[in-house]
């Protein structure tokens, strides 16, 4: 089907970059500028994404791709493909509506985004607190009491390059 | 693309243990907090817990505490959901869901959920 | 702890619109998301953030929150749209979910 198809429709040779051309006799002409079509056969090119504002450009708009945005410093990305900027917060804070607010005694935020999560409960996971928490950290959980015998030593292990809620940009 | 995929169904003796597995694919698994969600017949949503799959920190539902264990293994990019001392009023669909990044914390990817039965 | 009031059921004429509400106590000062739940299915994320759409869910769903109400609107319903919707909050250490709506399209 889709060789007949191809056969019957001349815009399926318009390749990416052009737009199947109604006035001119179904001929493939270059998208116009700030527009673009990332798929071969279509009628129309899209607009550019522009990046204004609080956005700013990532990647310039080509005839074949949109634009990308991220955000100015001070912000993060929320949704897909960046569709909207975010205020950061400081770690050991969270985002409200009314702006920035201090996560309250037995909560942590170890990032710039995000909500103020309680500190997890060791012993429900039948652990011990080996570090505890503060505004800006999880407590870490340690073996339980009773594995800790004599001599042994418990290590802190090194911070992770990335929490949950950073999503690669 | 984005997936989670659970174990099997389940059917349990009441009293028993039940662990359900959610793999996740096409992230970064550790970059995201993963919840637990049940759903009994008929009703509504549930939520269980959260695991943060990079240090193991976790956060359960009052309601589950002391019966709910949420655990992690990163080199399978897997979290497990175990329930214990079961009942028939633990029958229920239980669903991993991956945490997005809205203000306000939002389940932004579901798994296809796990039917556990308690029956004797 | 923190509680979220839906109304049982809602029904609607196709092409019409449909409002879901969601009731908590100040809620308009939360972040309320919104799922969809078909029979046999996982719930879809269809609104977060109160009234911000994620890609792939049509332009007919929005959503809106202030005071004691926060509402998902859904503008002319298609059969498609027949579904469980529940409304979702963060509160200080749990997530919790309203009861759900069934919303039937006549």
């Known amino acids: 089907f889709e060789r007949t198809r191809s056969l019957q429709d001349p815009c399926s040779n318009c390749p990416a970059g052009t737009f199947c051309d109604n006035n001119r006799n179904q001929i493939c002409s270059p998208c116009p500028p700030n527009s673009f079509s990332s798929a071969g056969g279509q009628r129309t090119c899209d607009i550019c994404r522009q990046c204004k504002g609080v956005f700013r450009t990532r990647k310039e708009c080509s005839s074949t791709s949109n634009a990308e945005c991220d955000c100015t410093p001070g912000f993060h990305c929320l949704g897909a493909g960046c569709s909207m900027c975010e205020q950061d917060c400081k770690q050991g804070q969270e985002l409200t509506k009314k702006g920035c607010k201090d996560c309250c005694f037995g909560t942590f935020n170890d990032q710039k985004r995000g909500i103020c999560r309680p500190w997890t409960n060791c012993s429900l996971d039948g652990k011990s607190v080996l570090v505890n928490g503060t505004k800006e950290r999880d407590v870490v959980c340690g073996p339980s009491p009773a594995d800790l015998s004599p001599g042994a030593s418990s290590v802190t292990p090194p911070a992770p390059a990335r929490e949950p809620g950073h999503s690669p940009q | 693309q984005m997936q989670l995929v659970q174990s099997g169904a389940e059917v349990k003796k009441p009293g028993a243990s039940v662990k359900v597995s959610c793999k996740a694919s096409g992230y970064t698994f550790t970059g995201y907090y993963m919840h637990w969600v049940r759903q009994a017949p008929g009703q509504g949503l549930e939520w269980m817990g959260w695991i943060n799959p990079n240090s193991g920190g976790t956060n359960y539902a009052q309601k589950f505490q002391g019966r709910v264990t949420i655990t992690r293994d990163t080199s399978a990019s897997t979290a497990y959901m175990e329930l214990s001392s079961l009942r028939s009023e633990d029958t229920a669909v239980y669903y991993c869901a991956r945490e997005g990044e809205a203000v306000g914390l939002d389940l932004d990817y579901w798994g296809q959920g796990t039917l556990v039965t308690v029956s004797s | 702890s923190y509680e979220l009031t839906q109304p049982p059921s809602v029904s609607v004429a196709p092409g019409k619109t449909a409002r879901i509400t969601c009731g908590g106590n100040?809620?308009?000062?939360?972040?309320v998301h919104w799922y969809q739940q078909k029979p046999g299915q996982a719930p879809v994320l269809v609104i977060y953030?109160?009234?911000d759409r994620p890609s792939g869910i049509p332009e007919r769903f929005s959503g809106s929150n202030s005071g004691n109400t926060a509402t998902l609107t859904i503008s002319r319903v298609e059969a498609g749209d027949e579904a469980d919707y529940y409304c979702q909050v963060w509160d200080s250490s749990s997530v919790v979910f309203g009861g759900g709506t069934q919303l039937t399209v006549l």
């Open positions: 100040n809620i308009g000062s939360k972040s």
């Open positions: 953030y109160d009234s």
